[in-house]
């Protein structure tokens, strides 16, 4: 089992985050297009 040092505020330290969001219509305050990581 994991020891506490493997976690930072409940998040696994080594886990990759989502990709940076894409704002294709950047000149408007639009919703982002998010593309999930392929593991």
């Amino acid at each position: 089992s994991y020891s506490m040092e493997h976690f930072r505020w409940g998040k696994p330290v080594g886990k990759k985050r989502r990709p940076v969001k894409v704002y294709p219509n950047g000149a408007e305050d639009e919703s982002a297009e998010a593309f999930p990581l392929e593991f």
Partner: antibody, heavy 113, light 112 residues
Framework: EVQLVESGGGLVQPGGSLRLSCAAS????????ILWVRQAPGKGLESIGM???????YYATSAKGRFTISRDNSKNTLYLQMNSLRAEDTAVYYC???????WGQGTLVTVSS | DIQMTQSPSTLSASVGDRVTITCQAS??????LAWYQQKPGKAPKLLIY???TLASGVPSRFSGSGSGTEFTLTISSLQPDDFATYYC??????????????FGGGTKVEIK
């Protein structure tokens, strides 16, 4: 108008510190992923760090331990605190709204004695 | 950190030519790849994201392909306004020990 405006660049001696600001207008900075990218004179683009919309920050190896990204939501502004500056940090520094066409105009940082 | 290797670094071409630029990632990044165009003294302009999706207002002569570690930007018929420097960018996720955002070294497309 949606835009980012950087400020705070200038001439600094090796080993010195500088804080760059990235002021957002037309959108709420805390709702978006923001990158810091630099470009040395005549060279290519280099991503040095980012802050996700939730406030988490990540840094390239070249910036880790020396650079810190923070955010002031009340001022709708992001900051890049740069310490222990070296000659190779000389560049135009841009803040960027995620992956998009919203880039600041850039601010030049020159590290020289 | 992710390493992005772009080739060629310089490309001499004529108006009307078909131009291909390649980008290789040091690790698989799925389709989290963008292409930017930069002209001297200007901020980069987004051309393509998600490896193959054209950004708003970008002419259809630009196209992108690839996934995983190998990517390509193609200009089907080079126009005078296309002489510029092109960069690929990975924008996959980061972790405490890995930074997944990186640019290729750039490809300068110049007039032959």
């Amino acid at each position: 108008e949606v835009q980012l405006v950087e400020s705070g660049g200038g001439l600094v001696q090796p080993g010195g510190s500088l804080r760059l600001s990235c002021a957002a207008s037309g959108f709420t900075v805390s709702a978006y992923d923001i990158l810091w990218v630099r470009q040395a004179p005549g060279k290519g683009l280099e991503s040095i760090g980012m802050m996700y919309d939730d406030g988490d920050t990540y840094y390239a190896t070249s910036a880790k331990g020396r650079f810190t990204i923070s955010r002031d939501n009340s001022k709708n502004t992001l900051y890049l605190q740069m310490n222990s500056l070296r000659a190779e940090d000389t560049a135009v520094y841009y803040c960027v709204k995620g992956v998009s066409n919203i880039w600041g105009q850039g601010t030049l940082v020159t590290v020289s004695s | 950190d992710i390493q992005m290797t772009q080739s060629p670094s310089t490309l001499s071409a004529s108006v009307g030519d078909r131009v291909t630029i390649t980008c290789q990632a040091s690790q698989s990044i799925g389709s989290s790849l963008a292409w930017y165009q930069q002209k001297p003294g200007k901020a980069p302009k987004l051309l393509i994201y998600s490896a193959s999706t054209l950004a708003s207002g970008v002419p259809s002569r630009f196209s992108g392909s690839g996934s995983g570690t190998e990517f390509t930007l193609t200009i089907s018929s080079l126009q005078p306004d296309d002489f510029a420097t092109y960069y690929c960018q990975s924008y996959e996720g980061s972790s405490s020990s890995y930074y997944g955002i990186g640019f290729g070294g750039g490809t300068k497309v110049e007039i032959k």
